[in-house]
């Protein structure tokens, strides 16, 4: 069976303050079943940015409909970017369970924020 890949095609993305940032992520397989979550950072402090299952993420939306059958695109859009949003963002696949088990992380996309042009 082919190993699942979590693909974050852009190593870095630069966005002007106030604009929206799109962070791309696709998976190579629908199997195994389980959610995708987005985090900023790695290790103990990694911050949950988006989780379709639960939580309130007012500035983050899924680019594609993640509930659609056979969806393999888990890209997100973060609106109204500020300098505080800078960091490395990881798209992470989990296997469904109780609790869900982390399977694989994308390589990360570094978001940098430019000053808004005057």
């Amino acid at each position: 069976e082919e190993e699942l890949q979590v693909i974050q095609p852009e190593k870095s993305v630069s966005v002007a303050a106030g604009d929206s940032a799109t962070l791309n992520c696709t998976v190579s397989s629908l199997i195994p079943v389980g959610p995708i979550q987005w985090f900023r950072g790695a290790g103990p402090g990694r911050e949950l940015i988006y989780n379709l299952k639960e939580g309130h993420f007012p500035r983050v939306t899924a680019v594609s409909d993640p509930t659609k059958r056979n969806n393999m695109d888990f890209s997100i859009r973060i609106s109204n970017i500020t300098p505080a949003d800078a960091g490395t963002y990881y798209c992470v696949k989990f296997r469904k369970g109780s609790p869900d088990v982390e399977l694989k992380s994308g390589a990360g996309t570094e978001l940098s924020v430019r000053a808004k042009p005057s």
């Epitope: 103990p44 402090g45 990694r46 911050e47 949950l48 992470v92 982390e102």
Partner: antibody, heavy 117, light 108 residues
Framework: DVQLVESGGGVVRPGESLRLSCAAS????????MSWVRQAPGEGLEWVSA???????YYADSVKGRFTISRDNSKNTLYLQMNSLRAEDTAIYYC???????????WGLGTLVTVSS | EIVLAQSPDTLSVSPGERATLTCRAS??????LAWYQQKPGQAPRLLIH???SRADGIPARFSGSGSGTEFTLTITGLQSEDFAVYYC??????????FGGGTKVEIK
């Protein structure tokens, strides 16, 4: 305003157990990593353990196998179960919020654990 | 494990003067170094992260600099409330996260 309030400290004998709690408020607890950092009397800071928002756990070698960190996101509470306590575990235990970049941006006031025969 | 060595252990400074504290890492921490202030009987307080970024509400008299393995915290125009113990922490390698031994800044 972010608030972290530790409880559960006290005096125990070597080999005994204690469970510390940290009640958090003022932020979306489930989204963030949380940590325990301790300070022995008159000494510096020592990182003890951490729990990421997604539930991964991390331990210092000095407590691995004896201490267990856990969290209840529904109660906004972090725990530290401390077993087989030793005299060298005597310290103030601080609960701290961990930023995405792995430093500590908010700290509780601490709870004192004394291990003495 | 990344070991952090702070120097000096104690720094005696007169109010209004400048204090320069050093933190040396046993390996490159890619600029991921934080500084904390701790007063007697209080919890530590974040001052600086990522070498030079001041935390919210921290006065401009606190500044951080450095790269690689050598980092500096500078306090210009020391005020009475600045006399405390200062710790550095590397946030590059989380297995484990480590602190320096601290520098006490006392009144001369």
């Amino acid at each position: 305003d972010v608030q972290l309030v530790e409880s559960g400290g006290g005096v125990v004998r070597p080999g005994e157990s204690l469970r510390l709690s940290c009640a958090a408020s003022g932020f979306t607890f489930r989204n963030y990593g949380m940590s325990w950092v301790r300070q022995a009397p008159g000494e510096g800071l020592e990182w003890v353990s951490a729990s990421s928002g997604s539930g991964s756990t991390y331990y210092a070698d000095s407590v691995k196998g004896r201490f267990t960190i856990s969290r209840d996101n529904s109660k906004n509470t972090l725990y530290l179960q401390m077993n087989s306590l030793r005299a060298e575990d005597t310290a103030i235990y601080y609960c701290a919020k961990v930023t995405w970049n792995n430093f500590f941006d908010y700290w509780g006031l601490g709870t004192l654990v004394t291990v003495s025969s | 494990e990344i070991v952090l060595a702070q120097s000096p252990d104690t720094l005696s400074v007169s109010p209004g003067e400048r204090a320069t504290l050093t933190c040396r890492a046993s390996q490159d921490v890619a600029g991921k170094l934080a500084w904390y202030q701790q007063k007697p009987g209080q919890a530590p307080r974040l001052l600086i992260h990522a070498t030079s970024s001041r935390a919210d509400g921290i006065p401009a008299r606190f500044s951080g600099s450095g790269s690689g393995t050598e980092f500096t915290l500078t306090i210009t125009g020391l005020q009475s409330e600045d006399f405390a113990v200062y710790y550095c922490q590397q946030h590059y390698d989380w297995s484990p996260l480590t602190f320096g031994g601290g520098t006490k800044v006392e009144i001369k």
